[in-house]
């Protein structure tokens, strides 16, 4: 997290706000609900209280405007700048302005007013932009999904550094951003994508370019807003320029940033029986046209060319790949080796000799 220079903050805990005007995109009630909910994000974790005024001057004046709207920080039409807010202080201090050239919504379409407002009110209270891609105060908008919003831990630490904690946090689960060099790090899924490596963990993935040591961390939804926050398995089919992503009993086919029409589909359409509730890992072999799927303690082989499960499957992981354990969290193939991830450990397995060559920490893939 980051706070503004000179640690700008309100010297009182009872703050007022006023909605000066409204966007035509939503009903008045939807706008009011979005702003109330956005303030609650911050009051839940601090001693701050927010009261709405219907007229007069409030600490935080909220308005919608377009282009030059009276503060010498003009908006720029659709997209780009969505909103801005001033840090705590007199006059403009604390005020939040929203660009009415955006389409404001209470869903995943356009820009979600609640999410943008919660971010802007963070500025109104003294938080600057965070470098943590999981933080609400990260400067890039990402729709985080329909489920109940949980303020990330980085934002909680930031706001409490200014105002301290509140009496009781009604939602004490604050998601942390994974640390790639945590020795206990386990991974959810790994796939290549057009020469890069995508390494999934929780609602994030690391993006590793070839010949590059520093992996970039992204929210999965910043790449693919329609995907679930967390995924179970992934693999690339390079000759078709597709990657396949699995979560529970569903899977998606993606071409770059775009989901193919007709997806998600059910994994039963690949030939899995209904007892299989999720795929834990998957890896595709371009030379043979086969894909291995791991679920529980079993491995399945799928023939991509004929689009059918191979006979004699499923088999036990321990029988086909002795020594790697009875489960696979994530897997990928490179230069004749399969890399199996099981908890914080990865196994380098030689396809030809059918032997484990090396055992390494899972996060050595991330250059830790």
């Amino acid at each position: 997290y980051n706070v503004f220079p000179r640690t700008l903050k309100w010297s009182k805990t009872n703050l007022t706000y006023r909605i000066v005007n409204y966007t035509p995109d939503l009903t008045h009630s939807e706008v009011e609900k979005a702003f109330k909910k956005a303030f609650k994000v911050w009051s839940d974790v601090t001693p701050l209280n927010f009261t709405r005024l219907h007229d007069g001057t409030a600490d935080i004046m909220i308005s919608f405007g377009t282009k030059e709207h009276g503060d010498f920080y003009p908006f720029d039409g659709p997209s780009g700048l969505l909103a801005h807010a001033f840090p705590p202080g007199p006059n403009y201090g604390g005020d939040a302005h929203f660009d009415d050239d955006e389409t404001w919504t209470s869903s995943s379409k356009g820009y979600n007013l609640f999410l943008v407002a919660a971010h802007e009110f963070g500025h109104s209270l003294g938080l600057d932009h965070s470098k943590d891609p999981g933080a609400l105060m990260f400067p890039i908008y990402t729709y985080t999904g329909k489920s109940h919003f949980m303020l990330p831990d980085d934002d909680v630490q930031g706001i409490q550094s200014l105002y301290g904690p509140g009496d009781e946090d009604p939602n004490p689960r604050h998601p942390k951003t994974p640390d790639k060099c945590d020795p206990s790090l386990s991974l959810d899924a790994i796939t290549s994508l057009r020469g890069e490596t995508m390494i999934f963990k929780d609602r994030f993935f690391w993006r590793l370019h070839p010949q590059q040591v520093d992996a970039e961390l992204f929210l999965t939804k910043s790449f693919w807003p329609e995907l679930p926050n967390r995924i179970d398995a992934a693999y690339e089919h390079p000759s078709r320029d597709l990657i396949f992503i699995f979560r529970g009993r569903k899977y998606w086919a993606l071409n770059g940033y775009d989901i193919l029409e007709g997806y998600p589909q059910k994994i039963s359409e690949l030939g899995f029986p209904k007892e299989v509730k999720k795929i834990s890992a998957a890896v595709h072999f371009e030379d043979t046209g086969k894909t291995l799927f791991f679920s529980g303690n079993q491995v399945w082989s799928y023939d991509d060319t004929n689009q059918i499960m191979d006979k004699d499957y499923p088999r036990l992981i321990e029988e086909d790949f002795p020594g790697i354990g009875d489960k696979v969290d994530a897997v990928y193939e490179k230069n004749g080796y399969i890399y199996f991830f099981n908890g914080p450990i990865q196994f380098e397995y030689n396809i030809w000799s059918k032997r484990i060559v090396r055992v390494m920490p899972a996060n050595s893939l991330l250059w830790c």
């Epitope: 659709p78 997209s79 890039i140 908008y141 790449f223 320029d241 071409n255 770059g256 940033y257 775009d258």
Partner: nanobody, 114 residues
């Protein structure tokens, strides 16, 4: 419905630069990812570069560090800046919005001679 028209192709010596443009008609351009693909004679069409709605970029390994993709949603235009061109970059370059099942331009020829 989005119509895409590429421009900026041409002939250039190895090591030279070109800037391709992709003009989109229709106000929905900003809702789609924008991609460049290319097809060399006798070869399959291949992905070159892509930029998401949120302006996250992605490049084929063969062009990374030489090509830069960008977009201007207000103008409804996408760009591909191609530097340090090589003879193997010779191809017809296609602009795409929305991926394989999305919208395609008719292409612009790029020829790089040694």
């Amino acid at each position: 419905e989005v119509q895409l028209v590429e421009s900026g192709g041409g002939s250039v010596q190895a090591g030279g630069s070109l800037r391709l443009s992709c003009a989109a008609s229709g106000s929905t351009f900003s809702r789609y990812s924008m991609n460049w693909y290319r097809q060399a004679p006798g070869k399959q069409r291949e992905f070159v570069a892509g930029i998401s709605v949120g302006r996250i970029t992605n490049y084929a390994v063969s062009v990374r560090g030489r090509f830069t993709i960008s977009r201007d949603n207000a103008e409804g235009t996408g760009y591909l800046q191609m530097n340090s061109l090589k003879p193997e970059d010779t191809a017809v370059y296609y602009c795409n919005a929305g991926g394989l099942q999305g919208y395609w331009g008719l292409g612009t020829q790029v020829t790089v001679s040694s």
